[in-house]
């Protein structure tokens, strides 16, 4: 009874299309598949960034797979052929592994790369990234930012740098069409007459770094003798109302401070008959239904009301 064997895939390689971390893993079918003409072979692919403890595992019938990686580190991948049990009248047969690695040869020492990279997507409209120059780099060092996301034909360079003393320390991005809910890749590299500069790679999703504008039009009405209704409006811009969460800070008579989080643009507050004055501020953030993370807006302007005045208004009405 001859043992059934299958070869590993051929020409397994990791291809870098220049998308700053989005790579292609591709291969050719194994040699001598003629015996299994009526059989659909599958491939088990495992890959990871070097240093990561866990492998990502994919089983596919295709001859490629695409995914994002951290190019600050190397990438390793391995693949083998699987012959399903239907093809072998018994148990699944696996080939030996074919392996591939990829890394970008680093230039310069790590300290030369940009420090404290910070990107904020203001009001889900304007992306701004800023950084500090590497440690010990001279003023002749300049940094350049490139970015890519699925939908762009190629990586683009920043066209509107923020400069200090002629040195690029940030980038104002143009309008980024259809760029949210997908990985956004950035590379900041550098050049200097004196020494090589290390490149840095960053990946994030834009909806997770949104800093909205603060809420506006804060109002206050007395619903009943001991109930005050606080209201505000969503900030202007593209963020829909369903995507906001709010934090309110309420001060009664400069003593009691209440901080609470709400999901709508209203909050009803119980007060005592001792309450004289009421002040509140609100800030907004993108909620968990629209993003995995976010940045709180600045606080709104503080609004204060005399409770007595509110009561008079209520009685008049």
């Amino acid at each position: 009874d001859t043992e059934i064997k299958v070869n590993p895939p051929q020409d397994f390689e990791i291809v870098d299309p220049g998308y700053l971390g989005y790579l292609y893993l591709q291969w050719q079918p194994p040699l001598s598949l003629d015996n299994f003409k009526e059989c659909t072979v599958e491939y088990e692919l495992k890959y990871r960034n070097i240093g990561s403890e866990t492998w990502t595992t994919i089983i596919t019938k295709n001859l490629h797979y695409k995914d994002g990686f951290d190019l600050n580190k190397g990438i390793e991948a391995k693949i083998h052929t699987l012959l399903p049990w239907q093809c072998t009248n018994g148990s699944e047969v696996q080939s030996s592994w074919a392996e591939a690695t990829y890394w970008i040869s680093p230039q310069g020492i790590p300290e030369t790369k940009v420090q404290d990279m910070d990107c904020v997507y203001y009001n889900w409209q304007y992306l701004l990234c800023s950084w500090k120059p590497g440690i010990g780099v001279l003023l002749d060092t300049n940094y350049n930012l490139f970015y890519w996301y699925e939908g762009l034909d190629r990586a683009l360079q920043c066209v509107d740098y923020i400069k200090v003393d002629g040195q690029n320390i940030g980038c104002r991005f143009p309008y980024l069409e259809s760029s949210d809910y997908k990985d956004f890749y950035i590379c900041v590299n550098g050049s200097s007459e004196t020494k090589p500069i290390r490149s840095s790679y960053f990946t994030f999703q834009l909806q997770n770094i949104v800093k909205p504008l603060p809420p506006v039009c804060l109002t206050c009405t007395q619903e009943s003798l001991y109930e005050i209704k606080l209201k505000w409006s969503i900030p202007l811009g593209p963020i829909p109302a369903r995507c906001f969460v709010y934090e309110i800070e309420i001060r009664e008579d400069d003593t009691t401070l209440v901080t609470t989080t709400v999901e709508n643009e209203t909050y009803t507050l119980k007060i005592t008959n001792e309450t004289r004055q009421l002040c509140f501020v609100v800030r907004s953030k993108v909620n968990i239904y629209c993003s995995d993370d976010g940045i709180w807006s600045e606080w709104s302007d503080k609004q204060c009301w005399e409770v007595e005045e509110l009561l008079k208004k209520t009685l008049l009405l």
Epitope: Q26, P29, L63
Partner: nanobody, 121 residues
Amino acid sequence: QVQLQESGGGLVQPGGSLRLSCEVSGSIFSINRMAWYRQVPEKEREMVAQITYGDTIKYYGSAKGRFTISRDSAKNAVYLQMNSLKPEDTAVYRCNIVGVLTTGHYEDSFWGQGTQVTVPS
């Protein structure tokens, strides 16, 4: 199914040029990768150049700087312009495509018969 027809091979003196063509015909829904390989008897096949996903072009080994791969999507064709040819470029050059058949659901690999390129020493 799918046929790949190569042409353009032949005998050329060292330093000369050749342009290989490969036309794809048959019931193919999408062509995702196009490549040229070469094989010398008793040796493993070797990738020369490829146009892969996202029209990314990659050259291998001594092909870098001397060979140029291009494609004509309208004609379903791939070309290999070979300049400054050397005796060590002598091989059978085979065209390969990776794509999905009109009746298929996943990628398959298709090969041409090959065209002989000879550069005498």
